[in-house]
Amino acid sequence: AGVFELQIHSFGPGPGPGAPRSPCSARGPCRLFFRVCLKPGLSEEAAESPCALGAALSARGPVYTEQPEAPAPDLPLPNGLLQVPFRDAWPGTFSLIIETWREELGDQIGGPAWSLLARVTRRRRLAAGGPWARDIQRAGAWELRFSYRARCELLAVGTACTRLCRPRSAPSRCGPGLRPCAPLEDECEAPPVCRAGCSLEHGFCEQPGECRCLEGWTGPLCTVPASTSSCLGLRGPSSATTGCLVPGPGPCDGNPCANGGSCSETPGSFECTCPRGFYGLRCEVSGVTCADGPCFNGGLCVGGADPDSAYICHCPPGFQGSNCEKRVDRCSLQPCRNGGLCLDLGHALRCRCRAGFAGPRCEHNLDDCAGRACANGGTCVEGGGAHRCSCALGFGGRDCRERADPCAARPCAHGGRCYAHFSGLVCACAPGYMGSRCEFPVHPDGVSALPAAPPGLRPGDPQRYL
C-alpha cells in the first residue's frame, strides 16, 4: 500500500505566439481544478479506459478574472497535493494523465459549467520511495509544470511497496528466513527473502532463496518479458533446453494465496482475497489484530485485541475486501446521467453536470417546468431551453422562495418614504411631490406639471403602487 502524490507548480500559457490570454471564456470569471488519473503499464491506453491505479481531484483554485492589457500570468492554482492511494504493489511503470478543468462562474442555469482545458499524458518508470520527479509538459497552447512521487504507507516498504513489515510497536517475531528491514530497526519483513536480484515487480517467493515469476515474465530473476520468447501464447517457466516457454501453471494454479485465501487472475498477475485475520499480497501475514492496523485506505477496524479474535474492517466508500485493500472503480458503473462527468474523489463520487442538469447523478432537468413548482404562488415559465419562475408580489429568487423587500431598491423618488405592503409598496411623498413613486413635482399653485393626481388623492398623500 502507498500513495502517489502530484504537486502542480504552475499552469499557464506556453511560450510563443498565439498563446491564450485567459483560461476563461468570454462569459466571465472562472477557476481551475485538476484531475489526476493513473493507469498501469506503459501502453497507450484509450482515454476513456478506467484509471485502474486510481484517480484524484483537486480542490477548486481561486477565482480568476482576466485583467485587460495585463500580461497573461501563471494562473491561480488550488492548494495542496493531489494524492492517489494505491493498494498492494506499486507497478513501477505507469501512465500519468493530468487534466486541467475550467469551472465557469458566469450566470449559467443550473450553476457552474465545466470544460476540459488541457490534458497531458506521460508514460513513466518510477520507483516508490524515490525523490520527487519534476516535469514540464505542453498541452496545446498551455504549459503545465509539476512534480510527482510514489511513497509507501502503513506496513509496506521497498521500491514497489511489496515488503510488509510489522510495526515497531508490535513484538518482534522475526522467525527463520525473516530479516530486519534495512531502513528501520526492530521491524521484520514478510514475505521471505527471495533470491538476490529477484525482480521486486515481477517475481515473488514463498521459501527463502527462490524466485518465482508472475505471468508474463521469465528468467532466473523474472526480469525477462515472456513475450520476447519465440514461443508465444504459452505461459510458465522457461525450458532449459529450448529456451521456449512451455505450458505451465496459470497465476492461480497451485493457489499462491496462503491461509485459505482465494485467488483470482488479473491481467498479467493474480489477486488474493484473504480471510479475516490474514492479509498481504498472498495472505501471508497472520496473527493480526486491530493493533497491527490491518485495515487499509482508511478502513475502520473492529475486533478484539488478542491474537485469537478476528477483526473486521469496515471500509470507506470506494474500497472493499477483507482489509479494504481493493479499490472499487465506481465510475465504471457510469452513474452520471444526461452527459454528466463522473469524478471519483476517493471518499465520494461526484457527477459534474452539464448546464441545465442537477442532482447527485445529474438526473434532474432544470430546464423544464414539468414537476417543478415555483413557490409562494409563482408560475413556471419555459423558454429558450431554460425555465424561470415569475414570482408573486413580495417574492423573488429563482424559485420565488426568497421574500423580496420591495423597498430595497429605494423606489420612492425625491425623498419619499417607502412602506412595504402586502401587495407591493407604498410611497409617502415629501411635500411638493406626488405620483406612485413620488416622481411628479407639484407646482406651487397646486397643479401638477404632469398627469394630475387621481380624484381623492391630494399631493403629498401616500400613493400605493400596484
Partner: antibody
C-alpha cells in the same frame, strides 16, 4: 467517523416557523448532497428535498415546495431545513441524510422531533 | 412522481426462516445506458434512523450480513433474508433514486 448531527426537539405553535439544523463531520461537506426526509407515525418516509452545498442549488418534492426551504452554510458544514406555516400535519421526525453519486442515503442524522401544538 | 408500493405491509416469522418482501415501482427504474436499477433498501429498527442495506437494487452495503439479498429489475424488486435473526426485527423500506426520491410504505418484520 462520518456523522450527521441534528438539532434538538422542537415544540411549536400552529402557523409558526421552525429551523432545523444538520451538522456534518467526518467528510467533505461540499462533495455530498444533503436530503431532508419526514417521518410520521404509520405514514412511512416522505422525501422533502435536497441541497447541493457546493452551489446552494435545492430541489424539492412539489408537495413541500411552499412549506419547506433548504439552505446550507459551508463555513460551518451545516444544512438547514426551514418549515413555515406549520399545522398539526407537520408533527413528525425530520431526518437529514447524505448522498453521493454512488451511494444513495448512506448516512443519516439521528432525527429531530417537531411537535406542532397549540 | 414515481410511486413505490411494498408488500406485505407486515409479516411475522420465526428465527431461521427465509423471508421475502416485494417492492413495485410505477415506472421502470432501469437506466438503459448503464443497465443499473436506481433502487435502494433500508432497514429501520425501533427508535433508530434508517440504515442503508442494498443499493443499485442488488449491491450489499459494506458491513451488511450476506443473509440480506436484493434482486429484481425494472419495476419489480425483492429483498430476501435467507435466515432471519432476532436482530432483524425492523421496518424495511425500498426507495427509488431514479427521479426525485420516493419511498415505499414499508414492510414491518416481526419475530414470532
Amino acid at each position: 467517523e462520518v456523522q450527521l448531527q441534528q438539532s434538538g426537539a422542537e415544540l411549536v405553535r400552529p402557523g409558526a416557523l421552525v429551523k432545523l439544523s444538520c451538522k456534518a463531520s467526518g467528510f467533505n461537506f461540499k462533495d455530498y448532497y444533503i436530503h431532508w426526509v419526514k417521518q410520521r407515525p404509520e405514514l412511512g418516509l416522505e422525501w422533502i428535498g435536497w441541497i447541493d452545498p457546493e452551489n446552494g442549488n435545492a430541489i424539492y418534492d412539489p408537495k413541500f415546495q411552499d412549506k419547506a426551504s433548504i439552505t446550507a452554510d459551508t463555513s460551518s458544514n451545516t444544512a438547514y431545513l426551514h418549515l413555515s406555516s406549520l399545522t398539526s400535519e407537520g408533527t413528525a421526525v425530520y431526518y437529514c441524510a447524505s448522498e453521493d453519486a454512488y451511494y444513495p442515503f448512506a448516512y443519516w442524522g439521528q432525527g429531530t422531533l417537531v411537535t406542532v401544538s397549540a | 412522481d414515481i410511486v413505490m408500493s411494498q408488500s406485505p405491509s407486515s409479516l411475522a416469522v420465526s428465527v431461521g426462516e427465509k423471508v421475502t418482501m416485494r417492492c413495485k415501482s410505477s415506472q421502470s427504474l432501469l437506466y438503459s445506458s448503464n443497465q443499473k436499477n436506481y433502487l435502494a433498501w433500508y432497514q429501520q429498527k425501533p427508535g433508530q434512523s434508517p440504515k442503508l442495506l442494498i443499493y443499485w437494487a442488488s449491491t450489499r452495503e459494506s458491513g451488511v450480513p450476506d443473509r440480506f439479498t436484493g434482486s429484481g429489475s425494472g419495476t419489480d424488486f425483492t429483498l430476501t433474508i435467507s435466515s432471519v435473526k432476532a436482530e432483524d426485527l425492523a421496518v424495511y423500506f425500498c426507495q427509488q433514486y431514479y427521479s426525485y426520491r420516493t419511498f415505499g410504505g414499508g414492510t414491518k418484520l416481526e419475530i414470532k
